[in-house]
């Protein structure tokens, strides 16, 4: 029952919480049989997905699966958002579910007053 359809193994509602300033690799697991498909990453902007053509990508080949990787070196605060990989295979376009990156900006997080601080010193809210 093994099919030779290209499969992209990104699950619905998948997400990653990452820190700004760190390196990060976003993986698109790809199964193919003979010829490796052409795979791209895009970032969702509303209902359209904007192709990331100028970003560093690479392939990692393992025994039964390959990974098309989008590199973030380093992660920037505006990398926050949803991404999708797509494979072109025999003139068919196969799209993955979107995967969401939640980027924490370490700099602003360290400057932000804690919940306890805000409770005991409410004027901090109005600094």
């Amino acid at each position: 029952k093994e099919s030779c359809d290209v499969q992209l193994y990104i699950k619905r509602q998948s997400e990653h919480s990452i820190l700004a300033g760190d390196p990060f690799e976003l993986e698109c697991p790809v199964k193919y049989c003979a010829n490796r498909p052409h795979v791209t990453w895009c970032k969702l902007n509303g209902t359209t997905c904007v192709k990331l053509e100028d970003r560093q990508t690479s392939w990692k080949e393992e025994k039964n699966i390959s990974f098309f990787i989008l590199h973030f070196e380093p992660v920037l605060p505006n990398d926050n958002g949803s991404y999708r990989c797509s494979a072109n295979f025999q003139s068919n376009l196969i799209e993955s579910h979107s995967t969401t990156l939640y980027v924490t900006d370490v700099k602003s997080a360290s400057e932000r007053p804690s919940k306890d601080e805000m409770a005991s010193r409410p004027w901090l809210l109005y600094r």
Partner: antibody, heavy 121, light 112 residues
């Protein structure tokens, strides 16, 4: 050949915890795309999806029962476990595990024979 | 949750005749990835469910080609071109596009 078999206690009293085991063969839960779901069916009624565990240990639950459910796997022994806390008579049903295969998303291509639970005081 | 409604509740068919079951969803099952995750199962009397069709129209392995699935959006149909005795049981549609995954109430196929 893919097979799945459920096992459970058969009878529980209200407020007890239900522990179910799905033992399977013919596939590995470490393979990309593979998963196992639990689905239940009260006698003479329809099907209700409960929970799913994916190849990478990611989990999804039916929100209507999420607070009472836990799902886990033992990949090396080809088993998936479901726990439901504080059972009630409404949990009386046949419980099935099903293999989640993948074609862009999960679909259930093989089902176990089911294990019956009766909750009664 | 997405509600799946099947009709008719019961279908009485003579062997060799065609049969058709309708399944409607309260939300579109067309996913943002372009696929429609609508599936069909058959539960024969006293047995566990068996997969028939996934992704609207793809026949699962070992399923005879007298079964065909069609539809889009919110309206779907399962057709049997010539009913055989082994086809009796309850047919369920279910959707895998939206969490939680949900099932139709079932259509019982009886042999006349």
């Amino acid at each position: 050949q893919v097979t799945l078999k459920e096992s459970g206690p058969g009878i529980l009293q209200p407020s007890q915890t239900l522990s179910l085991t799905c033992s399977f063969s013919g596939f590995s839960l470490s393979t990309f795309g593979m998963g196992v779901s639990w689905i239940r069916q009260p006698s003479g009624k329809g099907l209700e999806w409960l929970a799913h565990i994916y190849w990478d240990d990611d989990k999804r639950f039916n929100p209507s029962l999420k607070s009472r459910l836990s799902i886990s796997k033992d990949t090396s022994n080809n088993q998936v476990f479901l726990k439901i806390t504080t059972v009630d008579t409404a949990d009386t049903a046949t419980y099935y595990c099903a293999r989640g295969n993948w074609d862009g998303e999960t679909y259930f291509d093989y089902w176990g024979q089911g294990t019956t639970l009766t909750v009664s005081s | 949750d997405v509600v799946m409604t099947q009709s008719p509740l019961t279908l009485s068919v003579t062997i060799g005749q065609p049969a058709s079951i309708s399944c409607k969803s309260t939300q579109s099952l067309l996913d943002s990835d372009g696929k429609t995750y609508l599936n069909w199962l058959l539960q024969r009397p006293g047995q566990s469910p068996k997969s028939l069709i996934y992704l609207v129209s793809k026949l699962d392995s070992g399923v005879p080609d007298r079964f065909t699935g069609s539809g889009s959006g919110t309206d779907f149909t399962l057709k049997i071109s010539r009913v055989e005795a082994e086809d009796l049981g309850v047919y369920y549609c279910w959707q895998g596009t939206h969490f939680p995954w949900t099932f139709g109430g079932g259509t019982k196929l009886e042999i006349k």
